[in-house]
C-alpha cells in the first residue's frame, strides 16, 4: 500500500452531552477527489469500526442515518463529531484515510485520538 | 434511468476547437465522476480524462495535456470537454461516461458518442 | 503508462459453445489492499461500450452469469460458458491502478 501521514489530536474530552470533535488531517501525496474516511475504536487491544463515509471533494461528508459521527470536510482536513458517548465508550478513536479516486489508492491511518468520557453526575433531588 | 446524452456530430478544419458537450440525467450529476474516452475509427478505447462535477477538479492523461479542458454546468447537469489545435488524428468518435464508486471506478453509464472529423 | 495487451485479436465462435479471451497487463493490477483493478468492457455493433466486470471477476448487474472474469495479478480471462448471438462485439480489458487509464485493444467476438 502508498503509505500517507494522517494526522490527529493526542486527547480530547467529551463534553458533558456525550460528544467529542476533533480534526483529522491527510498529507495527500496526490490530486485526490473522493476520499474513504473511517473512524476505528481501539479498546483493550480490539478494534471496532465506529463510522465511515466516502466523499467526494466538494461535495458534503455523509454518514449513514443512524450514525453516531457527523462531519465537514475542507481540503484535506476532516472535521469529525462523535455523539452519544458514555463514559464505558472512553478509548482510543483511530482516523483512517483511504484516496479512493484518481489511482493510485493510497491508505493513512492516524495515531489515534484518546477520547475520554465522564458521565455526568445525576442531579441531586431539589426541594422546592 | 440514468442517461448521457452527448452533442451532435461535428466537422472541423485542421488547428479548429471543438466543444462536445454531456448533459446526464437520472440521477444526481454531482455524485459521479464524468469520465471522457475516445475511439479513433477502427481502433481501441483512449482515456482523455475525467472531471469532479463538485468543484470542477479534473485529472487528464499526459498526451492531451494543454489541449483539453473539461468542464461542468451543474445547473443543468452537463459535462463539456473542449480539444483545441485539432489534427487529423484527432478523428474519432469521443465518449463521456460515468464513473461508479461500487464497482470501484468503472464506467457504468455511457453517452452515445459524438463523431468528431477534422479534415481539411 | 501500464500496457494491456489482449489476445487474439479475433474470435470466431459456434453459439452454445465457450469462448474464452486473454488479457496481459505490463504490471501486475493486483494492489496490497486486496483489489485486482481489472475491467472488462463489450462494444456491441454501433453501440457504446458496456460494462461486464469489475474487479477482475465481478458481474456488473444485469450481466448475465455466463460471463465470468478469472485472473492473476498479470494474466486474466474473461469466459463465456455458452456463447449468444447477442454476444458478438469487441470485448476490451482495461485497467485503473494508475493513470492514466488504459485499455487492451480488443479482441472481436464473431459468430461462425
Known amino acids: 500500500c502508498k503509505a500517507m501521514h494522517v494526522a490527529q489530536p493526542a486527547v480530547v474530552l467529551a463534553s458533558s452531552r456525550g460528544i467529542a470533535s476533533f480534526v483529522c488531517e491527510y498529507a495527500s501525496p496526490g490530486k485526490a477527489t473522493e476520499v474513504r474516511v473511517t473512524v476505528l475504536r481501539q479498546a483493550d487491544s480490539q478494534v471496532t469500526e465506529v463510522c465511515a463515509a466516502t466523499y467526494m471533494m466538494g461535495n458534503e461528508l455523509t454518514f449513514l442515518d443512524d450514525s453516531i459521527c457527523t462531519g465537514t470536510s475542507s481540503g484535506n482536513q476532516v472535521n469529525l463529531t462523535i455523539q452519544g458517548l458514555r463514559a464505558m465508550d472512553t478509548g482510543l478513536y483511530i482516523c483512517k484515510v483511504e484516496l479512493m479516486y484518481p489511482p493510485p489508492y493510497y491508505l493513512g491511518i492516524g495515531n489515534g485520538t484518546q477520547i475520554y468520557v465522564i458521565d455526568p453526575e445525576p442531579c441531586p433531588d431539589s426541594d422546592f | 434511468q440514468v442517461q448521457l446524452v452527448q452533442s451532435g456530430a461535428e466537422v472541423k478544419k485542421p488547428g479548429a476547437s471543438v466543444k462536445v458537450s454531456c448533459k446526464a440525467s437520472?440521477?444526481?450529476?454531482?455524485?459521479?465522476?464524468i469520465n471522457w474516452v475516445r475511439q479513433a475509427p477502427g481502433q481501441g478505447l483512449e482515456w482523455i480524462g475525467d472531471i469532479n462535477p463538485n468543484n470542477g477538479g479534473t485529472n487528464s492523461n499526459q498526451k492531451f495535456e494543454g489541449r483539453v479542458t473539461m468542464t461542468v454546468d451543474t445547473s443543468i447537469s452537463t459535462a463539456y470537454m473542449e480539444l483545441s489545435r485539432l489534427r487529423s488524428d484527432d478523428t474519432a468518435v469521443y465518449y463521456c461516461a460515468r464513473l461508479r464508486r461500487e464497482y470501484f471506478y468503472a464506467m457504468d453509464y455511457w453517452g452515445q458518442g459524438t463523431l468528431v472529423t477534422v479534415s481539411s | 503508462d501500464i500496457v494491456m495487451t489482449q489476445s487474439p485479436l479475433s474470435l470466431p465462435v459456434t453459439p452454445g459453445e465457450p469462448a474464452s479471451i486473454s488479457c496481459r497487463s505490463s504490471k501486475s493490477l493486483l494492489h496490497s489492499n486486496g483489489i485486482t483493478y481489472l475491467y472488462w468492457y463489450l462494444q456491441k455493433p454501433g453501440q457504446s461500450p458496456q460494462l461486464l466486470i469489475y474487479q477482475m471477476s465481478n458481474l456488473a448487474s444485469g450481466v448475465p452469469d455466463r460471463f465470468s472474469g478469472s485472473g492473476s495479478g498479470t494474466d486474466f480471462t474473461l469466459k463465456i460458458s455458452r456463447v449468444e448471438a447477442e454476444d458478438v462485439g469487441v470485448y476490451y480489458c482495461a485497467q485503473n491502478l494508475e493513470l492514466p487509464l488504459t485499455f487492451g485493444g480488443g479482441t472481436k467476438v464473431e459468430i461462425k
Open positions: 437520472g440521477y444526481k450529476f454531482t455524485d459521479h465522476f
